[in-house]
C-alpha cells in the first residue's frame, strides 16, 4: 500500500518549485546603489523556499528558467517630484559570480513613481541577483508597494 | 524499471493548477471602491479553474503561493487627465475573512493611464481578493486593457 | 488497479513546460506595426522551448493557458518626448489564424517611456502572437529593456 502510494507521488523538492518573495530592508550607503532585501514569515508575507539571502541579495540554489518580477515605488513622489529630480532607474541583474554579470531588467521612472515588470531568464545555482536603484530618491518600504521575487518555471 | 518510471510521475489533479483570469464587469456604487469582476468562456477569454467569484470578488479554493497579477486602464484618460484627477490608486488585497485582511499590491496612476503589476503571495482557501480603485476616474471595460488574475504556483 | 493508477499519472516531460523569452530583432517596414522578435542561446538570454518563431512572430505549439508578458522601452525618450509623440500604443494579440484574431493586451505610453504587463490567456497550437507598436517612436533593442515571452501554465 505504502509502495503504491509512493508510485503516485513525486517528491515536492524534486519539482524544483523554488520561489521567493522579498520585501525591502534598506538601501545601501552612498556609493552602493543596491537595494537590500529581507524575507520570512515573521516579517509578513515574504518568504524564501529554495533561494537564500546573502547580505540582502538573492542567491539562486537551483538551475533553471525563472520568472523574475519586481515592483519599486518611490517614497516621496508625485508626478512633478519624479521630473524635478535626477533620473531614477532600476536595474535587476546577476551581480555574482562576476563571470556571469549581466543586466536582466531595466526601467526608468520618468514621470511615474512606481515601476513594475517581470521577465523569464535562465539562472544557475550560485547566481546572485542585485537590484540597483540609481537616483536621489528613496524607495518606499511598504510591503505592498516595493517587492522583488523569483519563481522557478522549468529546468 | 517500472518503479523508477513511476517515481517520475505525478497525479495531474494534485498539481493544484488553480488559475483564474477575470475581466471587469462593473464598478461599485458610490461609497464602494471595489471593482466587480466576471469570468467564463462565454464572456471571451476569461476563465476560472478552481477559484470562484463571490459577488464579483475572487475567492480562493486551494491553499498555496499564488502569482497575482492585474492591469487596470482608466477609460477616458490622457496624461493631463490622470494628473488632474490625481490621486487615483489601485490596491489589491485580501478583504475577507476580516482576520486576514491585508493590502497585497498598491499602485498610483500619477501621469499614466494604465497600471500593471504582479506579485507572489501566500493565499489560503476562503481568502477573498478585492481590488479597490480610489479616485474619480472610471476604468475601461475593454478586455485587453483591464484584467485581473491569479495562478497557483506551489503549496 | 495498477492500470487505473497509471491513468492518473503524467510523465514529467509531458507537463507541457513550453516557454519562450524573446528579444527584439527589428521593427517592420513603414505600414507594418509589428515588432519582429528573435530568440536563442547564441543571442544571449533569450530562448524557445516549445514555441517557434515564424518570420519573427511567436507561434504556439501546445494548447493551454499561458502567461504572456512583455516589456517595451522607447529608444530615444524622455517624459516630454513620450507626451509629444503621443499616442504610442503597444498591443499583443493573436494575429493568425485569422479566425482567432483578437487583442489580448494593450497599453499606451502616455508620459512614460516603458510599458510592462502580463496576463493569463488560453492559446491553441498554431496561434501566432503579434506585438503591434503604433506611433512614431522606435523601441530600444537593449535586451534588458525590451523583451516578450510566454510560459505554459496549465492545460
Amino acid at each position: 500500500q505504502r509502495f503504491a502510494q509512493a508510485q503516485q507521488q513525486l517528491p515536492l523538492e524534486s519539482l524544483g518549485w523554488d520561489v521567493a518573495e522579498l520585501q525591502l530592508n534598506h538601501t545601501g550607503p552612498q556609493q552602493d546603489p543596491r537595494l537590500y532585501w529581507q524575507g520570512g514569515p515573521a516579517l509578513g508575507r515574504s518568504f524564501l523556499h529554495g533561494p537564500e539571502l546573502d547580505k540582502g541579495q538573492l542567491r539562486i540554489h537551483r538551475d533553471g528558467i525563472y520568472m523574475v518580477h519586481i515592483q519599486v515605488t518611490l517614497a516621496i513622489c508625485s508626478s512633478t517630484t519624479a521630473s524635478r529630480h535626477h533620473p531614477t532607474t532600476l536595474a535587476v541583474g546577476i551581480c555574482s559570480p562576476a563571470s556571469r554579470s549581466i543586466s536582466l531588467l531595466r526601467l526608468s521612472f520618468h514621470q511615474g513613481c512606481t515601476i513594475a515588470s517581470q521577465r523569464l531568464t535562465p539562472l544557475a545555482r550560485g547566481d546572485t541577483l542585485c537590484t540597483n536603484l540609481t537616483g536621489t530618491l528613496l524607495p518606499s518600504r511598504n510591503t505592498d508597494e516595493t517587492f522583488f521575487g523569483v519563481q522557478w518555471v522549468r529546468p | 524499471q517500472r518503479f523508477a518510471q513511476a517515481q517520475q510521475q505525478l497525479p495531474l489533479e494534485s498539481l493544484g493548477w488553480d488559475v483564474a483570469e477575470l475581466q471587469l464587469n462593473h464598478t461599485g456604487p458610490q461609497q464602494d471602491p471595489r471593482l466587480y469582476w466576471q469570468g467564463g468562456p462565454a464572456l471571451g477569454r476569461s476563465f476560472l479553474h478552481g477559484p470562484e467569484l463571490d459577488k464579483g470578488q475572487l475567492r480562493i479554493h486551494r491553499d498555496g503561493i499564488y502569482m497575482v497579477h492585474i492591469q487596470v486602464t482608466l477609460a477616458i484618460c490622457s496624461s493631463t487627465t490622470a494628473s488632474r484627477h490625481h490621486p487615483t490608486t489601485l490596491a489589491v488585497g485580501i478583504c475577507s475573512p476580516a482576520s486576514r485582511s491585508i493590502s497585497l499590491l498598491r499602485l498610483s496612476f500619477h501621469q499614466g493611464c494604465t497600471i500593471a503589476s504582479q506579485r507572489l503571495t501566500p493565499l489560503a482557501r476562503g481568502d477573498t481578493l478585492c481590488t479597490n480603485l480610489t479616485g474619480t476616474l472610471l476604468p475601461s471595460r475593454n478586455t485587453d486593457e483591464t484584467f485581473f488574475g491569479v495562478q497557483w504556483v506551489r503549496p | 488497479q495498477r492500470f487505473a493508477q497509471a491513468q492518473q499519472q503524467l510523465p514529467l516531460e509531458s507537463l507541457g513546460w513550453d516557454v519562450a523569452e524573446l528579444q527584439l530583432n527589428h521593427t517592420g517596414p513603414q505600414q507594418d506595426p509589428r515588432l519582429y522578435w528573435q530568440g536563442g542561446p547564441a543571442l544571449g538570454r533569450s530562448f524557445l522551448h516549445g514555441p517557434e518563431l515564424d518570420k519573427g512572430q511567436l507561434r504556439i505549439h501546445r494548447d493551454g493557458i499561458y502567461m504572456v508578458h512583455i516589456q517595451v522601452t522607447l529608444a530615444i525618450c524622455s517624459s516630454t518626448t513620450a507626451s509629444r509623440h503621443h499616442p504610442t500604443t503597444l498591443a499583443v494579440g493573436i494575429c493568425s489564424p485569422a479566425s482567432r484574431s483578437i487583442s489580448l493586451l494593450r497599453l499606451s505610453f502616455h508620459q512614460g517611456c516603458t510599458i510592462a504587463s502580463q496576463r493569463l490567456t488560453p492559446l491553441a497550437r498554431g496561434d501566432t502572437l503579434c506585438t503591434n507598436l503604433t506611433g512614431t517612436l522606435l523601441p530600444s533593442r537593449n535586451t534588458d529593456e525590451t523583451f516578450f515571452g510566454v510560459q505554459w501554465v496549465r492545460p
Epitope: Q30, I76, T136 | - | -
Partner: antibody, heavy 118, light 107 residues
C-alpha cells in the same frame, strides 16, 4: 507644514565638540534627506552633510574628518557633531530638508548661532 | 568640488526694474541648479529648482534659465519685498556647493 528646530549650546570652547540636534515636527523624518548647512557671520552658505532615516550619510569632503551626522527616527530628530572646533567654525547652523540626496532644500530651520570662543 | 561664482556681488536697483543675476559653475552641472532668497536674520527660501522651475508659491516675476555652466536669475519687475541676498546652489555632485551670494539693494 513641516517645521525644523535646531537646539544646542550657543557657545563651544576651541578644540571641543560642537553638538546640535534638529527636531522635525509636522511630518515624518522617514524617506527625506536631512542636511546641516552653516553660514559664518556676513558670509555665504556651506553644506556640511546629510542623512536619511536609515542612517546613510554623505559629508562635505572638506569637513568629513570632523563631522558625524546621526538620526533617531523614534524621536524624529537628527544630530550634528563637529569635533576639534576653532573660531572658523563660528556660524549660524541650519537644519534643512530635501526630497532627494542631491536636491534643492525646501524646508529650513530658523538657524542657531554657535560661537567658538574661550 | 564644483565652484559656483555669482556676479555681481552687489546690485543696486529700483522698484520696477528688471534685474538679472548670473551664476557660473566651474564644470557642467546640466540643469541641477537652485536659486535662494535670504533676508537678514532669516533662513534662505528656495525660489527656483532645476535651473528654470518655479517653486510653488513663488511669484511669477522670478524666473531662471541656463544649463551647463551658465545660469541666470531674473526678476522681471522688482518689488520692495525683493531686496535681499540671492544664492545659487548646484546639486549635480554629492558635495553640493553654493555661490558666494549677490546682495540686491535699493538704489
Amino acid at each position: 507644514q513641516v517645521q525644523l528646530q535646531e537646539s544646542g549650546p550657543g557657545l563651544v570652547q576651541p578644540s571641543e565638540t560642537l553638538s546640535l540636534t534638529c527636531t522635525v515636527s509636522g511630518g515624518s523624518i522617514s524617506y527625506y534627506y536631512w542636511s546641516w548647512i552653516r553660514q559664518p557671520p556676513g558670509k555665504g552658505l556651506e553644506w556640511i552633510g546629510n542623512i536619511n532615516y536609515m542612517g546613510n550619510t554623505i559629508y562635505n569632503p572638506s569637513l568629513k574628518s570632523r563631522v558625524t551626522i546621526s538620526v533617531d527616527t523614534s524621536k524624529d530628530q537628527f544630530s550634528l557633531k563637529l569635533t576639534s572646533v576653532s573660531a572658523a567654525d563660528t556660524a549660524v547652523y541650519y537644519c534643512v530638508r530635501a526630497e532627494g540626496s542631491l536636491d534643492a532644500f525646501d524646508f529650513w530651520g530658523q538657524g542657531t548661532l554657535v560661537a567658538v570662543s574661550l | 568640488d564644483i565652484q559656483m561664482t555669482q556676479s555681481p556681488s552687489t546690485l543696486s536697483a529700483s522698484v520696477g526694474d528688471r534685474v538679472t543675476i548670473t551664476c557660473r559653475a566651474s564644470q557642467s552641472i546640466s540643469s541641477w541648479l537652485a536659486w535662494y532668497q535670504q533676508k537678514p536674520g532669516k533662513a534662505p527660501k528656495v525660489l527656483i529648482y532645476k535651473a528654470s522651475n518655479l517653486e510653488s508659491g513663488v511669484p511669477s516675476r522670478f524666473s531662471g534659465s541656463g544649463s551647463g555652466t551658465e545660469f541666470t536669475l531674473t526678476i522681471s519687475s522688482l518689488q520692495p519685498d525683493d531686496f535681499a541676498t540671492y544664492y545659487c546652489q548646484q546639486y549635480n555632485s554629492y558635495s553640493c556647493t553654493f555661490g558666494q551670494g549677490t546682495k540686491l539693494e535699493i538704489k
